[in-house]
Structures are given as structure tokens and as C-alpha cells.
């Protein structure tokens, strides 16, 4: 619900957004995701930091853990054991990479109202979790895995070979965390807690990235991370499973890798438990167009895991890489052998398929010139998923229910007509057996979270409606936003345009292109945001545009895989094409056009500035990739193949920013990077700067000492203030 626009006399009381509003997070929104603990109960941390249990059916709630207890150990997070006897309290949070962090853990006994003393957990712990049933604990400390049958028991050590930067047990190394698993953990309990599966990553032979961390000491520290760049030696992964009831009996048993995968370099991509004695592993060849899903069974007689070839399912792409960003994971049905999975159909759109015996005999469940995006839950009679089908807007997300108990299966859109103007981009969170679910709407209006009955889809209550935000925005002149498409040479380019509040088509406005453009990304989404570009439109009178070109997601494989083995070409072309179309619209001042982006967007903005079109007056690249030889193997090779003569070295060399140094001569370029960027290494910007200096091309630069890829904290304020000055100067806007 965007605040209604007021006119005439009241317009004087309205004010534009300020940069301060953005940097202070004045107009940030809240979401409500229930922490489900059963079919009808969830936990939530109240405003005063008590942990409260809500029972939907009785309508009653009560506190299970007081803020006093939380505060006594400075806890910032908690986790209830499934048997409801204990809570772990997490404190001393210390961030490592994108998902990983270490913390101190305390176990609180709810029955006695006191902390468990004796056999306390070591510190800091890298990962800790309860078993899915009861109150067993698995945790990772110093790269080794430990098991406790009960919180007060002494630990049983499962692995012994863990070594910093060498062997990782139960947690991923850098590249698996960032580019494959997207988690801080690499261990998985079986559904009833009988078995614990875990990954071991051996990084012994991986080259190390080293950079200085300046800190406050006399000498800087050197940070060393095993980080495989494109073409380098990769981690060696093995999967083990241990019986947690009798862990010392036979010890961890290795799960065999499918022969067709093991014949060359490969990755492990995910593990899904089906039952306590059946597990599903997904593997991927290093050349990431072949994925194998392997279903393995426990053999009681040998105490080993057997993965018959008949239970191997191959997924192969002939036009690009396997999957979207990641290979999708299966959602098993109640028979514990058949499953639902999203992959490309014969028309090149990602859709839900039902696999009972072989992939070749898969039954297609959804179809159309749109894409199924996520399978949330499969119950005995329903499958809940999200897609961008509704009204043919790829940047929307609605939740659908397919009845799988009846034939033919019927489909119902659960969200399409709930709050049609306000809510067009949803996600969902389901309780056990999908008895209830929460819907979280991200926009385009002010976000709202609601609770629903899983059988009737009736709304039970509003969990969070951001009333304070709505009131705060009542006197703000927000920019107007529109999402439309351009049809160019059989390519559909969706764009979002953010227009100044008093936009007048007969006037000329400076244009800023904000680009990301990475493979399988999507920037044009129907979501709410009050951010830096909202301020630039509201206060500084700029038009901002975001364009989804070739390589972006959820519009079919033709668009997605167009960039395969050719990064840095079509993404840039499509931004340029869109700019030309925007100029034709008549309200853009073609002498004042800029482009900016971060990460992959910094790469694209740099290439666009160096395209020699003369379209851009200036631009900004924040933490850009400058050569694909500098970036992580798992990500880069997925889209580019290997940087070898007999593979794709030529395009690796042709697609660098440095190769275009000469072309920056006629643009104003601002290059920005954090010196402690573990992800896109400072090396990338250092090489751009060197090439520009060598070409005697003037440019502006800003580094952020000891900052990573996110440029967080005080750096954020400095960054956006600095970029604002740069753009205002470029567009001749007074300060």
C-alpha cells in the first residue's frame, strides 16, 4: 500500500527523501517469519526480547524464555530442542564469510530454569544444531565434528583430522560456502536423528589468496584463504555418515560417488535425507553441465551405504549449465522414492517435474512460458510452489497450490488476488504438514506478513503490517515506479523505471542505470524499497532504470543461457540497447547519463563505460570483477568453462576490463573497492587501476581499508555520500 498522493495545498507539507533518511534506515521494513515448532505452534522473539510460544489453535501464547535469561549471557539467537527440554543460547557472534560465523553457546534447561553445568561446550563453536528428534547435539569445533547424546553429557569426537585452512569437517570451505552450498554448515541429521551425514573438504592443494588486514597494530596481519580461482586446483570432497546411536561401533562410513562423476573433477552439491535409512546426494561434474542425483540405502548387514546405479538420475544441459544458479534440490513424496524437482522442460522453461523411476519418464507438473521458482512443501494431497506465471510479469512471485491427491491435479493461486496492488512478490513459510503457513509479501507496496490456514487458505491474522512505516511515509514524496518491457530483436528486456515525484514527460532528466546483470539474477522485481536510488529520484530529480538483459533468470533458457561461455558481452549490449530506447522516450537528457553497479554489476558498468558508445558521461564500479581469471572456480567455470587453450581461454582474455583501459579516456570513472574483500579480491580493482595508469587515463578511486565485499558499517555512509557527490558533479546538480 503506497501512501496516497496528495495534491495542491497539502503538497507543501510533503518532503523529499534525504540521503540521511537512507543511511539511517528510517524507512526500513519488518517481516515476520514464524519459528515453527509443530503443526500449530511457533516461537517468536517479542519486542522486549522474551521468547514467546504461540498456539494458533488455542489462540494462546506464553513466554518460554525470559529476556532476563537471554540478557544474562548476551544472547542474540536461540534454538529450542525438538523435545522442548532445552534451548541453546547463542552469543559472541563473530562473522566470518557470507554465511559463516563463530559463537559461544550456552544450554538452558527449561524444566529446571537453569543453565546446564558440567561438560560445557567449547568456544568458539563454528556450527551447532539439535537433532530433529530429542535433544542430541552436533557441533563443529576447530574443524572437527562432535556429538552429545544429551546436553550435559561428555562429547563424542567424530572426526580427528580437522585443520585450519586444510581439512574442514561439517562446515564448508570458502568456495563451497559461497558458491555451492550457500550455508555455514555441511552436516545433515537424518529425519529421526539416527544418522548424521557430513562433508569433509580437503583444501590441502588449493592455492591461497593472501591480503593484508591493517587493523590497529604496528604490523598488518595477513589473511590467508584457500580460494580456487578459475582453472585452479579445487577442494576434494567426501561424504560420510555415522550412526549416532552407536557412534563408536563402526565409525563414519563413506558414501560412494557415482562412477560417471568420479571419473574426473567433481563437486558435491547437496544432501537430502528421505528416511532414516535412505539418503539422496547430488553431484556435479567440474564442467557443470552434468548433474547426478544418487539415492542411497543403508545396508544393515554391512553397516554401509549402497547407491545402486538404478537409483542414479542424470540431469544434463545441452545449451548451458545444469540448473539455474544452483542445481535444484528434490522434494520427496510420501512413498520415499519418487520426488518433485524443478528443471528445464523441452521448451526451455524451468518447471516442476515428478520423477518416479527415471528422469526420461518424468511427468511434467507445471508448464507454460513462465517459470516455477521454488517448491515449498509437498503433503499427502498438496504441492505448494512459487512461480512468476500471473499476468506474465517475470518479476513477480505468487504462491500456488496443486492438488496431487486428485486427478487431474487442480491448480489454485493462493496469493494472486489477496492484496493485488500492494502484494505481488511473496514467499511462504509452512508449519509441519502444512497445517498453517505464513505469507510474507515484499511489495510493491509496504510489506505485510500474514498467517493462513493450510487447508482453506483463509487468513487468520496479520503478523506484521509495518504500520509505523506507513505513517512515516505519509509526508514523504516518494518516486513513482513503473515496470515495463522493451521488445528488441526478439529479446524481451524488462525494466524498472524510478521517476521523480513531479515527473513531467515534456522535461529532460538525467538518467542513472543501476546494473547487476549476473547470470541467473533478476533486478526487475515487484518489491518495496526505499533506498539510495529512491533518494536520487525523490530529492535529486534523477530517473533511475534497472534492466534485465540476456543472462538473467526466470524467463526461460534462451535468455538465461545466452551468455554461456561469453560473459561480458550480451549483458553489456542489452544495457546499452535499453539506454538508447530510453533516450527515444524523449524525457532523458542524453548528455547526462550514468551507470553504476556493484560486484558483477561493477564489471558490467565498467564494460559499458568502456564500450566506446559515447552514451555514458560517467559511471561507478563498486568491488568489480575485472578478469574472470581472478574469480572463484565454482562460479566462473559454471558460466565460462575453463581458462585453458583447448577450452575458453580466449574469451577469458577478451572479456577483461583491463583490455579496454584506453576506452575510459572519455568518461568519468569512479572505482571503489574494500581492501579486505574475501570474495571479489582487491586485486581486481588494483589491476584496473594499473591498466588505467599505464594507459595514462585519469580516473577517480576510493578504497575502504579492512572492508569486505559488503562495505558495511561506517563505510556504507561514506560510500553513498561519496557516490552522491560524484553523480551530482557529473550531472551538474548543485549541492
Amino acid at each position: 500500500l503506497r501512501p496516497s498522493r496528495v495534491h495542491n495545498s497539502e503538497e507543501n507539507t510533503m518532503r523529499a527523501l534525504t540521503l540521511k533518511d537512507i543511511l539511517n534506515g528510517t524507512f526500513s521494513y519488518k517481516t515476520f517469519f514464524p519459528n515453527w515448532i509443530s503443526g500449530q505452534e511457533y516461537l517468536h522473539q517479542s519486542a522486549d526480547n522474551n521468547i514467546v510460544l504461540y498456539n494458533i489453535e488455542t489462540g494462546q501464547s506464553y513466554t518460554i524464555l525470559s529476556n532476563r535469561t537471554m540478557k544474562s549471557v548476551n544472547a542474540s539467537n536461540y534454538g529450542l530442542s525438538p523435545d522442548r527440554q532445552f534451548v541453546y543460547l547463542e552469543s559472541d557472534y563473530s562473522k566470518l564469510w557470507r554465511y559463516s560465523y563463530t559463537a559461544t553457546y550456552y544450554i538452558y534447561d527449561l524444566s529446571n530454569g537453569e543453565f546446564v553445568r558440567g561438560n560445557e561446550l567449547p568456544r568458539p563453536i563454528q556450527y551447532l544444531c539439535w537433532s530433529p528428534v530429542g535433544s542430541k547435539l552436533a557441533y563443529v569445533y576447530q574443524n572437527n565434528i562432535y556429538l552429545k547424546q544429551r546436553p550435559g553429557d561428555p562429547p563424542f569426537q567424530i572426526t580427528f583430522n580437522g585443520r585450519e585452512n586444510k581439512i574442514f569437517n561439517g562446515i564448508p570451505d570458502w568456495v563451497y560456502e559461497e558458491e555451492m552450498l550457500a550455508t555455514k554448515y555441511a552436516l545433515w541429521w537424518s529425519p529421526n536423528g539416527k544418522f548424521l551425514a557430513y562433508a569433509e573438504f580437503n583444501d590441502t592443494d588449493i592455492p591461497v589468496i593472501a591480503y593484508s588486514y591493517y587493523g590497529d597494530e604496528q604490523y598488518p596481519r595477513t589473511i590467508n584463504i584457500p580460494y580456487p580461482k578459475a582453472g585452479a586446483k579445487n577442494p576434494v570432497v567426501r561424504i560420510f555418515i555415522i550412526d549416532t546411536t552407536y557412534p563408536a561401533y563402526v565409525g563414519p562410513q563413506e558414501v560412494p560417488v557415482p562412477a560417471m562423476i568420479a571419473s574426473s573433477d567433481y563437486y558435491f552439491s547437496w544432501l537430502t535425507w528421505v528416511t532414516d535409512e535412505r539418503v539422496c546426494l547430488q553431484w556435479l561434474k567440474r564442467v557443470q553441465n552434468v548433474s547426478v542425483l544418487s539415492i542411497c540405502d543403508f545396508r544393515e548387514d554391512w553397516q554401509t551405504w549402497d547407491c545402486p546405479k538404478t537409483q542414479e538420475h542424470i540431469e544434463e544441459s545441452r545449451t548451458g549449465w545444469a540448473g539455474g544458479f544452483f542445481v535444484s534440490t528434490p522434494v520427496f513424496s510420501y512413498d520415499a522414492i519418487s520426488y518433485y524437482k524443478i528443471f528445464s522442460d523441452k521448451d526451455g522453461y524451468k518447471h516442476i517435474h515428478y520423477i518416479k523411476d527415471t528422469v526420461e519418464n518424468a511427468i511434467q507438473i507445471t508448464s507454460g512460458k513462465w517459470e516455477a521458482i521454488n517448491i515449498f512443501r509437498v503433503t499427502q494431497d498438496s504441492l505448494f510452489y512459487s512461480s512468476n506465471e500471473f499476468e506474465e510479469y517475470p518479476g513477480r512471485r505468487n504462491i500456488y497450490r496443486i492438488s496431487i491427491g486428485s486427478y487431474p491435479p487442480s491448480k489454485k493461486c493462493v496469493t494472486c488476488h489477496l492484496r493485488k496492488e500492494r502484494c505481488q512478490y511473496y514467499t511462504a513459510s509452512f508449519s509441519d504438514y502444512a497445517k498453517y503457513y505464513a505469507l510474507v509479501c515484499y511489495g510493491p507496496g509496504i510489506p505485510i506478513s500474514t498467517l493462513h490456514d493450510g487447508r482453506t487458505d483463509q487468513e487468520i491474522k496479520i503478523l506484521e503490517e509495518n504500520k509505523e512505516l506507513e505513517n512515516a511515509l505519509k509526508n514523504i514524496q516518494l518516486p513513482k515506479e513503473e515496470i515495463k518491457k522493451l521488445e528488441v530483436d526478439e529479446i524481451t528486456l524488462w525494466y524498472k523505471m524510478i521517476l521523480p515525484p513531479q515527473f513531467d514527460r515534456s522535461k529532460k532528466y538525467p538518467l542513472l542505470i543501476q546494473v547487476y546483470g549476473g547470470p541467473c539474477s533478476q533486478s526487475v522485481r515487484s518489491v518495496f524499497a526505499v533506498n539510495w536510488i529512491s533518494y536520487l529520484a525523490s530529492k535529486e530529480g534523477m530517473v533511475i532504470a534497472l534492466v534485465d538483459g540476456r543472462g538473467t533468470a526466470f524467463q526461460g533458457d534462451k535468455l538465461l543461457y545466452a551468455v554461456y561461455r561469453k560473459l561480458g558481452v550480451y549483458e553489456v549490449e542489452d544495457q546499452i540497447t535499453a539506454v538508447r530506447k530510453f533516450i527515444e522516450m524523449g524525457f532523458i537528457d542524453e548528455k547526462r547519463i550514468a551507470i553504476w553497479g556493484w560486484s558483477y554489476g561493477g564489471y558490467v558498468s565498467s564494460l559499458a563505460l568502456a564500450s566506446g558508445t559515447g552514451l555514458f558521461k560517467c559511471g561507478i564500479a563498486v568491488a568489480p570483477v575485472s578478469s574472470w581469471e581472478y574469480y572463484a572456480s565454482v562460479y566462473t567455470e559454471r558460466f565460462m568453462g575453463l581458462p585453458t587453450k583447448d577450452d575458453n581461454l580466449e574469451h577469458y582474455k577478451n572479456s577483461t576490463v583491463m583490455a579496454r583501459a584506453e576506452y575510459f579516456r572519455n568518461v568519468d570513472y569512479l572505482l571503489i573497492h574494500g581492501t579486505a574483500d574475501d570474495n571479489v579480491h582487491f586485486q581486481n580493482s588494483a589491476q584496473i587501476a594499473k591498466a588505467l595508469v599505464n594507459a595514462q587515463v585519469d580516473f577517480q578511486a576510493m578504497w575502504y581499508s579492512d572492508q569486505n565485499h559488503g562495505l558495511s558499517g561506517l563505510s556504507t555512509n561514506h560510500l553513498y555520500t561519496h557516490m552522491t557527490h560524484f553523480l551530482k558533479q557529473c550531472f551538474s546538480l548543485s549541492d
Epitope: 509443530s38 503443526g39 500449530q40 505452534e41 522474551n50 510460544l53 498456539n55 489453535e57 488455542t58 489462540g59 494462546q60 506464553y62 513466554t63 518460554i64 524464555l65 525470559s66 529450542l80 522442548r84 527440554q85 527449561l110 524444566s111 530454569g113 497445517k435
Partner: nanobody
Framework: QVQLQESGGGLVQAGGSLRLSCTAS????????MAWYRQAPGKRRELVAG???????NYVDSVKGRFTISRDNAKNTVYLQMNSLRPEDTAVYYC?????????????WGQGTQVTVSS
């Protein structure tokens, strides 16, 4: 204000049976997740059995197959049927929400009911 009243304890010989009852009064709904807990002399209180709103149950290993938790929503009452009792089952038995409630109006445990199993 909500009160929980446990009853049904007593002295019983090993191998015998007892049925404990717990009745909730006040605004409380008996359909909340409920549990039986026990505390043996000199030991910490521990969970014995729990029953969720959907009537699914949980038992600690030591009582599995011997104890049964059940409820009567109409009477706001939770029961614990204890069979094949052993001397080590001797304790004060309490009922409470599962997990137990803390805080105003419901913050303390009831008196409990004493179960003594003689050998």
C-alpha cells in the same frame, strides 16, 4: 491466573500401576501442548512425557512402552498412565505446559504429586 493441580500419586509396589491426573483451571485451554515432569530426590527435574496440540506424543527413553500420556480437552485434563513401575520412577511428578511456562500469572510449578515405588 491459571492453576495446575496434579493428583493420583501414591505408594505402589514395583511392577504396579498408577494413573496421574492434571487439571487446569482459569482461562487456559487444555489443547495446548502439555507434559509430565518429575524430580527425584537430589536430582534435577526432567521431562517424562509430552503431548502436543495434535495429540502426538513424546517419551523419554526410560519410560517408553510403560507410560502413556493422554488428554481430555473437554475436561482440561492431562493424564499419565504408569505401568510396570520401577523403584527408579520414584519422584514428585508435575505437569506443566510443554515447554514449561514462565512469567506472570503462570510462573511457578504446582505442588506436584508424590509417586513412591517400593521394591
Amino acid at each position: 491466573q491459571v492453576q495446575l493441580q496434579e493428583s493420583g500419586g501414591g505408594l505402589v509396589q514395583a511392577g504396579g500401576s498408577l494413573r496421574l491426573s492434571c487439571t487446569a483451571s482459569g482461562t487456559f485451554s487444555g489443547r495446548n501442548a502439555m507434559a509430565w515432569y518429575r524430580q527425584a530426590p537430589g536430582k534435577r527435574r526432567e521431562l517424562v512425557a509430552g503431548i502436543r496440540s495434535d495429540d502426538s506424543t513424546n517419551y523419554v527413553d526410560s519410560v517408553k512402552g510403560r507410560f502413556t500420556i493422554s488428554r481430555d480437552n473437554a475436561k482440561n485434563t492431562v493424564y499419565l498412565q504408569m505401568n510396570s513401575l520401577r523403584p527408579e520412577d520414584t519422584a514428585v511428578y508435575y505437569c506443566n505446559l510443554w515447554p514449561p511456562v514462565i512469567g506472570a500469572g503462570f510462573g511457578s510449578w504446582g505442588q506436584g504429586t508424590q509417586v513412591t515405588v517400593s521394591s
